[in-house]
Interface confidence: low
C-alpha cells in the first residue's frame, strides 16, 4: 500500500527503524512525498537493515566483499528530453535514479533554468526499495501550463555532499503569439512620415505580422516579427493595430489612435478675475490643444470707447497658468479683451471678446499752482490751487485734502481739512503766531487720495506786523519755497 506523508518542518527518515521482514519487491512505492506548498527535501533516508553496515560518505559505490556485486555509478536514468504542448494543457514528467541502500541523507530537488523550484508546484517523489537499492522516481506535474513555464527542468540529488544532476527536460509551451512591443499612439504632423513597431513571439515561431489601418489590412503579405510599418503620411486621424499569426492562431494588438496635429481651438470662458484702476487680471480655459502642446498665448486688448482710435494692445505670455495680468491701462475705462493661443502648428482663432472695465483710481497727480498768503486782518491763511488735469484724476473728483503743519520753537502740529470738489480755494485759521505754516494739497476721488502737492511755507509773525505777499508753489527745482518779505 502507498503511504503518503505531508511535509513538515523537519525532514523525515525513509525507514524510521529496523525494517521488519523482507523488502518489498513488487515495486509498490513504499512512501510518496507530495510537494504542494513550501519546498522540503524530497528524500531523506537512513536504511538500517540488519547486517548492512553504514559505509560513510561514499559517492561512487565500491565493492565491499567477495559476495557483493559491484554497484553502478550513481546517475539519473535518461528520460524524455523535449516536451512540446499547448498553453493551458497539463503535463507530467519525471526523473528516476537507483540509489544503493548504503547511502543516508539523500535529497532530490527540482530546478528550472538554474533556479530551484521552491513552491507552488506539484512534485511527488516515490520510492521502490529493493534489498540492495532503492529506485526513486521524482515526478513533476503542472495542471495548466503557461508561457512562463517554458524552460529547462532538471533534478538534482545531494548524496553525501556530492551533487548528481539529471539531463535537462525542455518544456516548450506553445500558444497564440504574445506581444512584446505594440504600436504606440502618436500625434503626427499632417502628411509627414512616421513609423509604428510591432513585435510578437511564440512559441511556436515564426510569428508573422499583418498591419491593420481603420479595420483594413495594410500589407497583403505578412512580415516576420518584428515589423516596422512606415506610414508615408496621414491627412486625418487613423487607428492602427497589428495582427500576429503563428501556427496556433492569431492575436490582435490594441488599436492605437494616430492623431493629426492641428491648430488649437480658441480658448473659452475668458473671465475677469480682478480689476484695479490700471490693471485687469484675466483667466481663460484653453481650447483643445490640437494634439500638440500649447507654446504661448496672446492677449489682445482694445479700448471699447467708440471715440478711441481702435488700436489694439498685444500682450504675449506663456500658455500656463491660463492667467494674465494686463497692466498699464487707464482708470475708469472700458476695454474689449480676447485671447488666442498657439502650438507648433499655429495660432488659434481669438476667443469670444469680453468687455471689461478698470475701476476708479486715486488721482495720479497733485493739484497745481498752490498759493498761500496771510490775511492778517482776519487771522486767516488763504490757500488757492488749480485742479489736476481731468485725464489724470483717474476718477470723479469728490474733493481735496489739505494738510497744514504749524512749527514754532520745537512745537509741531499737523491738521487735515477736507473741502468739496467745486472749490479751488480754502481758508484756514491761524493756529500759532510767530510760526511757520507748511501747506500741501491732494485731490480725492472715490478711488482714494492722490499725491500731495509740493509743500508751500508761509511765516506767521507775531501780532502787529505789516501785511505780506503770498507764498506759492515754486517753479520746478526750488525745493523749499519761503515767504519773501
Amino acid at each position: 500500500a502507498i503511504t503518503e506523508a505531508r511535509e513538515e518542518a523537519k525532514p523525515y527518515p525513509l525507514f524510521p527503524g529496523p525494517f521488519p521482514g523482507s523488502l518489498q519487491t513488487d515495486h509498490t512505492p513504499l512512501l510518496s512525498l507530495p510537494h504542494a506548498s513550501g519546498y522540503q527535501p524530497a528524500l531523506m533516508f537512513s536504511p538500517t537493515q540488519p547486517g548492512r553496515p553504514h559505509t560513510g560518505n561514499v559517492a561512487i559505490p565500491q565493492v565491499t566483499s567477495v559476495e557483493s556485486k559491484p554497484l553502478p555509478p550513481l546517475a539519473f536514468k535518461h528520460t524524455v528530453g523535449h516536451i512540446i504542448l499547448s498553453e493551458h494543457k497539463g503535463v507530467k514528467f519525471n526523473c528516476s535514479i537507483s540509489v544503493p541502500n548504503i547511502y543516508q541523507d539523500t535529497t532530490i530537488s527540482w530546478w528550472k533554468d538554474g533556479k530551484e523550484l521552491l513552491g507552488a508546484h506539484h512534485a511527488i517523489t516515490q520510492f521502490y526499495p529493493d534489498d540492495e537499492v532503492t529506485a526513486i522516481i521524482a515526478s513533476f506535474s503542472i495542471t495548466s501550463v503557461q508561457r512562463s513555464d517554458n524552460g529547462s527542468y532538471i533534478c538534482k540529488m545531494k548524496i553525501n555532499n556530492e551533487e548528481i544532476v539529471s539531463d535537462p527536460i525542455y518544456i516548450e509551451v506553445q500558444g497564440l503569439p504574445h506581444f512584446t512591443k505594440q504600436p504606440e499612439s502618436m500625434n503626427v504632423t499632417r502628411n509627414t512620415a512616421f513609423n509604428l513597431t510591432c513585435q510578437a513571439v511564440g512559441p511556436p515561431e515564426p510569428v508573422n505580422i499583418f498591419w491593420v489601418q481603420n479595420s483594413s489590412r495594410v500589407n497583403e503579405q505578412p512580415e516576420k516579427s518584428p515589423s516596422v510599418l512606415t506610414v508615408p503620411g496621414l491627412t486625418e486621424m487613423a487607428v492602427f493595430s497589428c495582427e500576429a499569426h503563428n501556427d496556433k492562431g492569431l492575436t490582435v494588438s490594441k488599436g492605437v489612435q494616430i492623431n493629426i496635429k492641428a491648430i488649437p481651438s480658441p480658448p473659452t470662458e475668458v473671465s475677469i478675475r480682478n480689476s484695479t484702476a490700471h490693471s485687469i487680471l484675466i483667466s481663460w480655459v484653453p481650447g483643445f490643444d490640437g494634439y500638440s502642446p500649447f507654446r504661448n498665448c496672446s492677449i489682445q486688448v482694445k479700448e471699447a470707447d467708440p471715440l478711441s482710435n481702435g488700436s489694439v494692445m498685444i500682450f504675449n505670455t506663456s500658455a500656463l497658468p491660463h492667467l494674465y495680468q494686463i497692466k498699464q491701462l487707464q482708470a475708469l475705462a472700458n476695454y474689449s479683451i480676447g485671447v488666442s493661443c498657439m502650438n507648433e502648428i499655429g495660432w488659434s482663432a481669438v476667443s469670444p471678446w469680453i468687455l471689461a472695465s478698470t475701476t476708479e483710481g486715486a488721482p495720479s497727480v497733485a493739484p497745481l499752482n498752490v498759493t498761500v498768503f496771510l490775511n492778517e486782518s482776519s487771522d486767516n491763511v488763504d490757500i488757492r490751487w488749480m485742479k489736476p488735469p481731468t485725464k489724470q484724476q483717474d476718477g470723479e473728483l469728490v474733493g481735496y485734502r489739505i494738510s497744514h503743519v504749524w512749527q514754532s520753537a520745537g512745537i509741531s502740529k499737523e491738521l487735515l481739512e477736507e473741502v468739496g470738489q467745486n472749490g479751488s480755494r480754502a481758508r484756514i485759521s491761524v493756529q500759532v503766531h510767530n510760526a511757520t505754516c507748511t501747506v500741501r494739497i491732494a485731490a480725492v476721488t472715490r478711488g482714494g487720495v492722490g499725491p500731495f502737492s509740493d509743500p508751500v511755507k508761509i511765516f506767521i509773525p507775531a501780532h502787529g506786523w505789516v501785511d505780506y505777499a503770498p507764498s506759492s508753489t515754486p517753479a520746478p527745482g526750488n525745493a523749499d519755497p519761503v515767504l519773501i518779505i
Epitope: E184, S185, M186, N187, S215, V239, S241, V252, K254, G255, V256, Q257, N259, Y291, L320
Partner: antibody, heavy 120, light 108 residues
Framework: QVQLQQSGPELVKPGASVKLSCKAS????????INWVKQRPGQGLEWIGW????????KYNEKFKGKATLTLDTSSNTAYMGLHSLTSEDSAVYFC?????????????WGQGTTLTVSS | EIVLTQSPTTMAASPGEKITITCSAS???????LHWYQQKPGFSPKLLIY???NLASGVPARFSGSGSGTSYSLTIGTMEAEDVATYYC?????????FGAGTKLELK
C-alpha cells in the same frame, strides 16, 4: 455631448452573478476604451480593466481576473461587466469611464456609477 | 504595479487658503502619465488635471499641477467652499492602472 449612462442599483445574494451595463453616447464608441473602476464604501478607486470596442480586446487587472468579465454590444454602443461568485467584498459602486489614450491613459468621462449590494 | 502614495490623507482648510496635495510614485512615471481627479461626495470622479499640469475643460484656473519622475503635486491657489472633495492621483503608464488612496479636503 459625451455621456456614459449606467444601469440602476443591484441587490444580489452571495454566490450569484450580476451584469452591469454602460451605454455610451455623444462620441465614436469604437475609438475609445471603456474602463471599469470599483469603489468600496468610503474607500479609494480600483481599476478593474478595459475593453476596446473596435476589436473587443480586453485588459484586466490581475486581481479581478476570474471575477469580472467585460463584454460589448457595439450595435447599441453598450459595454457590460459581469461579476461572478459574488461575496460581500464585491459590494461597491462600479463606475464605467472612457479611456483617453494618446501616449498616456486617463479617464476623461465617467458614468454616474452603479451600486451593487451583495447580501443574503 | 506602480503604487501611488498621497499625502495628507485628510486636511481641513479655510476659504482663501492655498492647498497642496502630493502624490509619490513607487517608480518613475513620465509626467505625461500622471493625472488628477476630483470626487465630490455622492458623485462620480471628474477629471481635474491631465498630463501632470493640464486643466481639464471647465476646471477653474485656481487649480494647478506640477511634478516629474516620482513626485507630483496638485495645488489649489485659493480654496473655495465648492472645492470640498476627495482628490485622487492616477498613473496611466503601466497596467494595472492605479490610483492614489485619495486626499479628503474638508472645510475648516
Amino acid at each position: 455631448q459625451v455621456q456614459l449612462q449606467q444601469s440602476g442599483p443591484e441587490l444580489v445574494k452571495p454566490g450569484a452573478s450580476v451584469k452591469l451595463s454602460c451605454k455610451a453616447s455623444g462620441y465614436s464608441f469604437t475609438t475609445y476604451d471603456i474602463n471599469w473602476v470599483k469603489q468600496r464604501p468610503g474607500q479609494g478607486l480600483e481599476w478593474i480593466g478595459w475593453i476596446y470596442p473596435r476589436d473587443g480586446s480586453t485588459k484586466y487587472n490581475e486581481k479581478f481576473k476570474g471575477k469580472a468579465t467585460l463584454t460589448l454590444d457595439t450595435s447599441s454602443n453598450t459595454a457590460y461587466m459581469g461579476l461572478h461568485s459574488l461575496t460581500s467584498e464585491d459590494s461597491a459602486v462600479y463606475f464605467c469611464a472612457r479611456g483617453y489614450y494618446d501616449n498616456l491613459y486617463y479617464f476623461d468621462y465617467w458614468g454616474q456609477g452603479t451600486t451593487l449590494t451583495v447580501s443574503s | 504595479e506602480i503604487v501611488l502614495t498621497q499625502s495628507p490623507t485628510t486636511m481641513a482648510a479655510s476659504p482663501g487658503e492655498k492647498i497642496t496635495i502630493t502624490c509619490s510614485a513607487s517608480s518613475s512615471v513620465s509626467s505625461n502619465y500622471l493625472h488628477w481627479y476630483q470626487q465630490k461626495p455622492g458623485f462620480s470622479p471628474k477629471l481635474l488635471i491631465y498630463r501632470t499640469s493640464n486643466l481639464a475643460s471647465g476646471v477653474p484656473a485656481r487649480f494647478s499641477g506640477s511634478g516629474s519622475g516620482t513626485s507630483y503635486s496638485l495645488t489649489i491657489g485659493t480654496m473655495e467652499a465648492e472645492d470640498v472633495a476627495t482628490y485622487y492621483c492616477q498613473q496611466g503608464r503601466i497596467v494595472p492602472l492605479t490610483f492614489g488612496a485619495g486626499t479628503k479636503l474638508e472645510l475648516k
